[in-house]
Each structure stands twice: as C-alpha cells, then as structure tokens.
C-alpha cells in the first residue's frame, strides 16, 4: 500500500520507498551487520523507513542493498533520485582511513520479479554516488536534517522490470528516500489538439513525434504534431485545430455559443453576440434569427445587424416647369439599419376627369440622372406632356426591401404640367375658293397643350415670298379670307394658339382665287 | 546479548597504577569504538576520550593526556583504561561505553556498570 | 572547548506532569547532540541522539528538539521510573557533558 505523494505531472514514479506504509524489506547482503533498516520520523511526525550503514570502524567493506523487483511500464530510460545523508568522515568518533563518504549504485534487469539472492556479477553499475555540497534543509521530527538529493538516469531498458542495488564500501550514509521515475509527456491539449500520455524516448536527447487528435467539436486546420521531449516537455507545436461553426475555445476546449451568441465559421474567433435585432435560442448557434419585421440580405454578413426596409422619404417637393417636373424629397426617417439606401421613381399619367384613372407613363418620359437606383434625394424628369397630370411615386428601397414590401415606403405627388405652345396643325383644307375668297378649314393641333385661345392665319401672293403678308385671328376652326385678288396664287398658313404662345405654324396650303364668279370647292392643301 | 563487562571496585594508595578492563560480548568488538567516562562521587560526567577498536588509536579530552592510556586486547575482546600515579583526584566511577555511530548522530549506546576506583593513603 | 549549560539544576514535577529540560551551547554543535537518563548506582542510558533521534527502545514520551545552540528535552507525562539525572552531551567538537538535571518528586 502506497501512500499519495505529488510529483511534476511529467514524471511517473515506478518506485517511492516513503510512499510505502510498513517496512520495506529490501534484501541485505550480509543479511546483518551491513545495511538495516530504520523508521525515523519526519516532520510530520510519520514513521519513514530508511536503510542505514555506518560500519567506519572496519576496512573493506562490502555491503549491498537490493530493492523489489521494479517494473517497467514501458519506460524505455528510467530516473533514480535518492535523498540521502552521509556524514562526513571527519566528524566521526575514533575513525581513520577506512571511512568513506561515497557509494554505488548499480540495476540489474530482469524478467523475473522474484529473485531471492543478490548475485554482485549481475549487476552493472550506474554511478559512484558522493555527496555534494548544495544540501537540501529536510525537517527530520524536530530536527533539521541536510539530505543530498542525486539523479541517475539508466536506459535503454529493453526487460519487463529491473532492480537497484546499492553498495556501501566503508560509508556512514542513510538512504531516506529512494524514487524511481520516468518521465513522459503527459497528456495535454495545445492549439486545440489533444496529445496524449507519450513516454519520452531511449536515450536524453530522443525526441519523439506525435500526432494530434482535434478535441471535440473541431476540425483540422494543418495537421496538429508535437514532439515528446527527452525532459517530458513538449516541444514544437506544429499545425492547430480550430473550433466548428457554433463553438468557441474555452478553456482548451472547444464548447457550444451560449445562447444570444453565435460562430458562423470554423476560426479561432471567439463566438460573438448575436447582432441587433437578432437572436439565437440554442446554444451552438451558427447564425442568429432576425427578429421579426427584421431581415437578412442575401450578402449580408451573419455577423451584420439585421435591418428592415426604410420608411417613406419625407418632404416631397415638386416644382413643374412646363413638360418638366423636378422633384426633391428628404431622407426616410428610419433608414431600417442600412447604408444601402436608394429611391426608385414611379410615373403615371392620369386622366383629368378621372384621377384615379392612371397608367404608367411609358418609355416616352426621360429622368436625370435615372428612374431606379437613385442615389440623391433628387430627380428631374423631362418629356411629359402639357397640360397633363401626373402622379410622380418616389420609393424609398435598401437591401431588404424586396422581403417586405410595403406601400408605406414611397411618397407621392400629383402635378399637372403646364400649358405650352401647342403643335402644329396637321391638315388646312380650303373648303371654297371664289374670284376674291378663300374659306379656310383645319383640325385642332395633335398636342394643344392647354386650351387653344385663337389660330392665326398668315397669308401672302405666292409671288410677294411672304415679303408682304397679312393676319386673321379667329377662335374657329375655319375662317373666310376676303378682298383677295382674281385669279391669283395664294399661300395659307394656320397655326394655333394657347395661353403659352403659338405654336409652329402649319405647312403651306397653296390656293389660286377664280377668274369666273363661280365657287370652286376644294379640300386640298394645294388647291387651284 | 550486547553488553560490557567492567570489573569489581579498587582500592589504590597514591601513585600506584590501575588497569580497569571492560570485556564486549555480544557484538562485533572492531565494529565500534570504545569511549571511557569518569564521574567523580556526587558529580556529573566527564568524556575522557575513545579508542578506535580496529587501529587501537586512542583520542584523549583535555585533562586526561600522559596518566591516562586506553589499549586493547582484540583477542579477547576487551578493552583497557590504565591509570597511572594516582591521585587522590582520581576517586571516581570509571564507565566504558560503545559508541554507536549512525548517520543521523553518534552516543554511547551501551555501558559498563562501572568500576569504583578509590584513592586512598 | 564548548560548554554545554542545563536548566534548570532541579526539576520538580509530579507524576502524569510534562517536563521540559533545556542545554545551551557556548557554540553551535549543529545537531550533534545527544542525552543521556542517569539513576543512582546505575550506568548512564542513551535517550537520544542527533538532537531528537530516540535510541532503540526508548518510550515515545521522551521527545527532544533544537539545532545549532539550543536544545530541549521533554518528557510528556512523567512516569516514577523517569525521576533521574539527565545529561546532554556534545559531540560536535570534542565531546563534552553538561552538568545535569535532576527530575525530582514533587
């Protein structure tokens, strides 16, 4: 039975003679008068045993001391500390020469754990042991006692056990502690990968390679090796294993997110709070749900907030000039979280009667510098009719937008477009051409662009090139033009006239008045 | 068992000699040195000095050198303490003891029960 | 040489009492001291030596301690065999015996 001793986690102790409860019973040769075993107290007050040998009075001495049979376990190169006193020949009653203050130590390897006798020719020696002069203070009961500790170390060892011996030549020594060791790498984890017990190598400067296993919940990164020193410390680390998504190291291990935590990749990051607006209701999160009305876009990294898409601008400002429209608006209030902010525009032409009658304005429209995407609070858009409106919607989108639409993310503004020039008229007919009349007929512009105020008819003899012309101004679609001259050409134009000025004025109609009185009916641009 | 012989109590006259022999049984005689102690009547003890019992080298203490002499007769496992020109002085129990020797410290383990030297005219 | 002082001369206890003897050194003897129990007409018994290292079959209520100059012996409960003389002596240069102790009835 052993007692319970502490001793550095890389050394494994084979043999501790003051861990033993009761005598050792070792074999002595000679049976009596060399070595013998005494109890002496420690500072405990504990019973130690010891061996002993002081026979400095007598020359040529010869006496051995044999431990048990001590097993191996494996250990290829095996330590034997020994803490000892040996009094100095010098302090010694009545002694001459035959003192000594060395002793030796020798093993013999065995397969047998049962040998009865010493046979000396066995047993190879280790070392001559002396005591040196860097003494341990050990406290021996009440008393102070200065002990040498030595170290041998003896290897390879290729048998399943060996035994120690012990030789007194003449010395007055007690052996207060005998220790038998080896040393190992002890089981460690390092980067992540978990290394186990490795007995140390053969012989002191043997290094032997390990492989690594990834603890729990952790993947390769580059192949996790170490090397088991000679010492029993492991040198080198080479290569790591990093923690899965969901886990973080904690104490060499890697262990589950605590919930409201989350990892999304395998990394040697620590896990991280889930972000704003987002939670994780199990531990090993590998991302975190958005809370609900919030959302994740598609590119959106899992460690960025979760957003919503933008309220509706704010302060949406028209300003119509003639077939255009600028329209400025302010930022959304709430942005949703994002950066990503941009305004989509919406163009529908609505009847006048019927407002609610409205269809999209077709490809006709052109805005500046785009429809969609904008990323000002600004936007002109050219090419509308006159005198028409138009319900201009101005969506405030981001990144999450399409997960949620919602109406209440655009502004709206109903303008009508102010009246302009109107186009030119298509078709002027003369209707009846007489020796000193014209009557005249067209249609209303194509694009009146607001409410035709009067048309103006220009005409002059074709000879005179417009040198000298004349006007009449009638609110009718026709009008009799008198007092011309007979049988002479004459050119017509006709153009139309709203609150915004005239228009272009119509092509040429070309018309030579009679020589008889009689009406001619023409519906020609070119009549004769 | 282990133990020392000394012999019966003497009786001197000023200046003669004794020889107080103090015989081991028991043990190794040449394992041990032999110390000789002097305890005068109502007195304490006095370390005379010890003989090695392998060489026969004796160590005097102060105050017992030229009348004192320790010798040794390993055959027969006795050893000697001789007096010589006593002295009135030299009244005293005369005690041979072993000294046992160990790592831990040195005393003198076993005794002789003591001679009773008494000098007188 | 060195002196070995007792105290005190005399010491009187009762039986099933602790008694504590003291030795000074005029100098260090380290643990090289040793005590000694004396009865009248008998021949001294070694109790202790290296300080506090009780000799073969010595009861365990003798106990001693001390290193370098001071040194004690005590006797935990006293028993009737225990009244006696008791010496300490050095060996640690030379050899020397203190005067003694005497451990009388009270």
């Known amino acids: 039975v052993t007692g319970s001793r502490v001793y550095p986690a890389n050394e494994v102790t084979l043999l501790d003679s003051r861990s033993v409860q009761g005598e050792l019973g070792w074999i002595a040769s000679p049976l009596e008068g060399g070595w013998e075993e005494v109890s002496i107290m420690d500072e405990k007050n504990t019973p130690i045993r010891t061996y002993q040998v002081c026979n400095v009075m007598e020359p040529s001495q010869n006496n051995w001391l044999r431990t048990d049979w001590i097993t191996r376990e494996g250990a290829q190169r095996v330590y034997i500390e020994i803490k000892f006193t040996l009094r100095d020949c010098n302090s010694l009653p009545g002694v001459m020469g035959t003192c000594k203050e060395t002793f030796n130590l020798y093993y013999y390897e065995s397969d047998n754990d049962k040998e009865r006798f010493i046979r000396e020719n066995q047993f190879v020696k280790i070392d001559t042991i002396a005591a040196d002069e860097s003494f341990t203070q050990v406290d021996i009961g009440d008393r102070i006692m200065k002990l040498n500790t030595e170290i041998r170390d003896v290897g390879p060892l290729s048998k399943k056990g060996f035994y120690l011996a012990f030789q007194d030549v003449g010395a007055c020594i007690a052996l207060v502690s005998v220790r038998v060791f080896y040393k190992k790498c002890p089981l460690t984890v390092r980067n992540l990968a978990q290394f186990p017990d490795t007995i140390t190598g053969a012989d002191t400067s043997s290094l032997v390679e390990v492989r690594g296993s990834c603890v729990n919940n952790s993947e390769e990164k580059d192949v996790p090796k170490m090397y088991c020193g000679a010492d029993g410390e492991w040198l080198v680390p080479i290569g790591n294993c990093l923690c899965n998504a969901g886990h973080e190291e904690r104490s060499g291990e890697c262990q589950a997110c605590k919930i409201g935590y989350y990892k999304a990749l395998s990394t040697d990051a620590t896990c991280a709070k889930c972000p704003p607006h987002s939670y994780s209701v199990w531990e090993g999160a590998t991302s975190c749900t958005c809370d609900r009305g919030f959302f994740r876009a598609d590119n959106d990294a899992a460690s960025m907030p979760c957003t919503r898409p933008p309220s509706a601008p704010l302060n949406l400002i028209s300003n119509v000039n003639e077939t255009s429209v600028n329209l400025e608006w302010s930022s959304p209030q709430n942005t949703g979280g994002r950066q990503d902010i941009s305004y989509n525009v919406v163009c529908k032409k609505c009847g006048a009667g019927d407002p609610s009658k409205c269809r999209p304005c077709g490809s006709g429209v052109h805005y500046t510098p785009q429809q969609n995407g904008l990323k000002t609070t600004k936007v002109s858009i050219t090419d509308l009719l006159a005198h028409t409106n138009y319900t201009f919607e101005i969506w405030a989108v981001n990144g999450v937008s399409k997960y949620n639409p919602n109406p209440d993310q655009s502004v709206s503004v109903t303008v009508t477009t102010n009246q302009a020039a109107p186009s030119s008229i298509a078709l002027v007919q003369a209707k009846e051409v007489t020796r000193y009349s014209v009557a005249l007929a067209w249609l209303e512009p194509d694009r009146p662009n607001g409410v035709i105020l009067e048309y103006e008819v220009k005409y002059y003899e074709k000879d005179q090139n417009e040198r000298s012309y004349r006007i009449v101004r009638t609110a009718a679609r026709n009008t009799d033009i008198k007092g011309l001259n007979p049988l002479t050409s004459y050119v017509f134009h006709v153009r139309a006239r709203t609150a915004a000025g005239y228009g272009d004025f119509s092509e040429p109609l070309e018309v030579t008045t009679n020589t008889v009185p009689s009406r001619i009916i023409g519906d020609g641009a070119n009549s004769t | 068992q282990v133990q020392l012989l000394q012999s019966g109590a003497e009786v001197k006259k000023p200046g003669a000699s004794v020889k107080v022999p103090c015989k081991a049984s028991g043990y190794t005689f040449t394992s041990y040195a032999m110390s000789w102690v002097r305890q005068a009547p109502g007195q304490g003890l006095e370390w005379m000095g010890w003989i090695n019992t392998n060489t026969g080298n004796p160590t005097y203490a102060q105050g017992f050198t030229g009348r004192f002499v320790f010798s040794l007769d390993t055959s027969v496992s006795t050893a000697y303490l001789q007096i010589s020109s006593l002295k009135a002085e030299d009244t005293a129990v005369y005690y041979c003891?072993?000294?046992?020797?160990?790592?831990?410290?040195?005393?003198?383990?076993?005794w002789g029960q003591g001679t009773l030297v008494t000098v007188s005219s | 040489e060195i002196v070995l002082t007792q105290s005190p001369a005399t010491l009187s206890v009762s039986p099933g009492e602790r008694a504590t003897l003291s030795c000074r050194a005029s100098q260090s003897v380290s643990s090289n001291l040793a005590w000694y129990q004396q009865k009248p007409g008998q021949a001294p018994r070694l109790l202790i030596y290296g300080a506090s290292t009780r000799a073969t079959g010595i009861p365990d209520r003798f106990s001693a301690s001390g290193s370098g100059t001071d040194f004690t012996l005590t006797i935990s409960r006293v028993e009737p065999e225990d009244f006696a003389v008791y010496y300490c002596?050095?060996?640690?240069?030379?050899?020397?015996f203190g005067q003694g102790t005497k451990v009388e009835i009270k």
């Open positions: 002596q050095q060996y640690g240069s030379s050899w020397t």
């Open positions: 003891a072993r000294v046992r020797t160990t790592p831990y410290g040195d005393g003198m383990d076993v």
